[in-house]
């Protein structure tokens, strides 16, 4: 969780107006202080005891799990994934049964052929990972294959993924169109039959930081929000500090509860705090009000 | 994996004579082979081309000189060079198509094999 300011005081007004009794605590730092006595109670929101603290179940923690982290670790995939699966029809190549079995001399540099083909005509997209034979067949040399793309994930990755698998279709298609066979001659390194171009299918990885987020936060989900910084999802709850969502507290401590976040406010030697963001302060001694 | 080994070159005069041979280590049968040609200083060029069914092409440089032939038994191509030019000077290699290669009835740039080659010098 990201860093929040340590609150020194135990007195506490909530903002609707009582005083309440809480521990000393940054919000961010779980307590391991041991408890002595029936630990299976202790450990509440369906933490389990140890042997020697509470281990508390995603959003929880504190000393018996009574607490709601300010932000939920999630992670996004490293990179992100698209696969579309082509067929093509290579006319350059007779068709005989050994293109079926893998292991054969004949599929084993039809493989290496096509493929250098297929990275001959995808040079231009950096997404592109490569292909992949997934079946041959009769007419002449039918190519089922997947074209493999992959880019780092950012918020939107999908409309990269979209953009690359459209740049693969314009390709394959210009290529299927150039490189055909004339007059019985193919002087390219493979030639196609342009009406055998498909796309059959297009499977995008679906990552989504707001369903993760929510799912993580249980029945807080409703005050669990992400956020970006530096295009990395941040799960928090307006109690995180740094945010657009964050809550400011002013004079008090944020605690998110399961109506959402509020304010508990503080009591010092001098005032009293008050107000949905605790930023109404009351002189004790002239019982003064300030803003 | 096809090892293709040249032989057969060396110097020559001008209007003479020179055939060369390549050695294939498996079945050619089922392959398009060819001769290219890299001159110094110069790409690689395609001098001649035979198909499975033995239909050749040749590059406009060469024909009516050169004739490409092919003995599928002895899994061997050959060049037969005659009324050699100075300009015919340049490393010779033969290459062998993936198989069952179709299409190569004309100069075909498709061979995923290659020899290291033969310099054949051409020189009064």
């Known amino acids: 969780p990201l860093a929040t300011i340590p609150v020194s005081t135990t007195s506490l007004t909530s903002s609707e107006g009582s005083t309440i009794s809480t521990p000393s605590v940054d919000i961010s730092t779980p307590v391991t202080t041991s408890i002595v006595g029936d630990q299976c109670s202790r450990c509440k929101n369906g933490g389990f005891w140890d042997g020697l603290k509470c281990q508390c179940l995603t959003p929880y923690y504190g000393e018996s799990c009574e607490e709601v982290v300010n932000s939920i670790d999630i992670a996004p995939p490293e990179t992100v994934s698209a696969q579309m699966e082509l067929t093509v029809t290579v006319t350059s190549v007779k068709f005989t049964d050994e293109l079926k079995n893998h292991s054969s001399q004949e599929f084993r540099e039809f493989n290496k052929t096509f493929t250098e083909q297929m990275n001959i005509v995808y040079s231009g997209i950096p997404e592109y990972v490569g292909v992949n034979i997934t079946n041959l067949r009769l007419g002449s040399v039918v190519v089922e294959h997947d074209v493999l793309l992959r880019t780092k994930y950012t918020p939107e990755y999908k409309t990269a993924l979209d953009n690359a698998t459209e740049v693969v279709k314009q390709k394959i298609t210009k290529v299927t169109t150039e490189q055909i066979m004339t007059n019985d001659n193919c002087s390219a390194l493979m030639c196609f039959n342009t009406t055998g171009t498909q796309v059959q299918n297009i499977t995008v990885t679906q990552y989504d930081p707001v369903e993760e987020c929510r799912q993580k936060a249980e029945e807080y989900e409703d005050y669990f929000l992400v956020e970006y910084r530096d295009q990395k999802p941040y799960c928090i709850s307006p109690c995180e500090s740094g945010f657009n969502a964050s809550k400011n507290c002013n004079h008090g401590k944020c605690q998110m509860s399961q109506n959402g976040a509020r304010c508990l406010c503080v009591t010092t030697e001098t005032h009293w705090y008050s107000g949905e963001d605790c930023n109404q302060g009351t002189q004790k001694s002239h019982h003064h009000h300030h803003h | 994996e096809v090892q293709l080994v040249e032989s057969g070159g060396g110097l020559v005069q001008p209007g003479r004579s020179l055939r060369l041979s390549c050695a294939a280590s498996?079945?050619?049968?089922?392959?398009?082979m060819g001769w290219f040609r890299q001159a110094p200083g110069k790409e690689r060029e395609g001098v001649a081309g035979?198909?499975?069914?033995?239909?050749?092409g040749y590059a406009d440089s060469v024909k009516g000189r050169f004739t490409i032939s092919r003995d599928n038994a002895k899994n061997s191509l050959y060049l037969q060079m005659n009324s050699l030019r100075a300009e015919d000077t340049a490393l010779y290699s033969c290459?062998?198509?993936?198989?069952?290669?179709?299409?190569?009835?004309?100069?075909?740039?498709?061979?995923?094999?290659r020899g290291q080659g033969t310099m054949v010098t051409v020189s009064s």
């Open positions: 035979i198909s499975e069914d033995g239909i050749t």
């Open positions: 290459a062998a198509s993936i198989l069952n290669r179709v299409g190569c009835r004309q100069l075909s740039y498709e061979y995923i094999y």
């Open positions: 498996g079945d050619i049968t089922r392959r398009c």
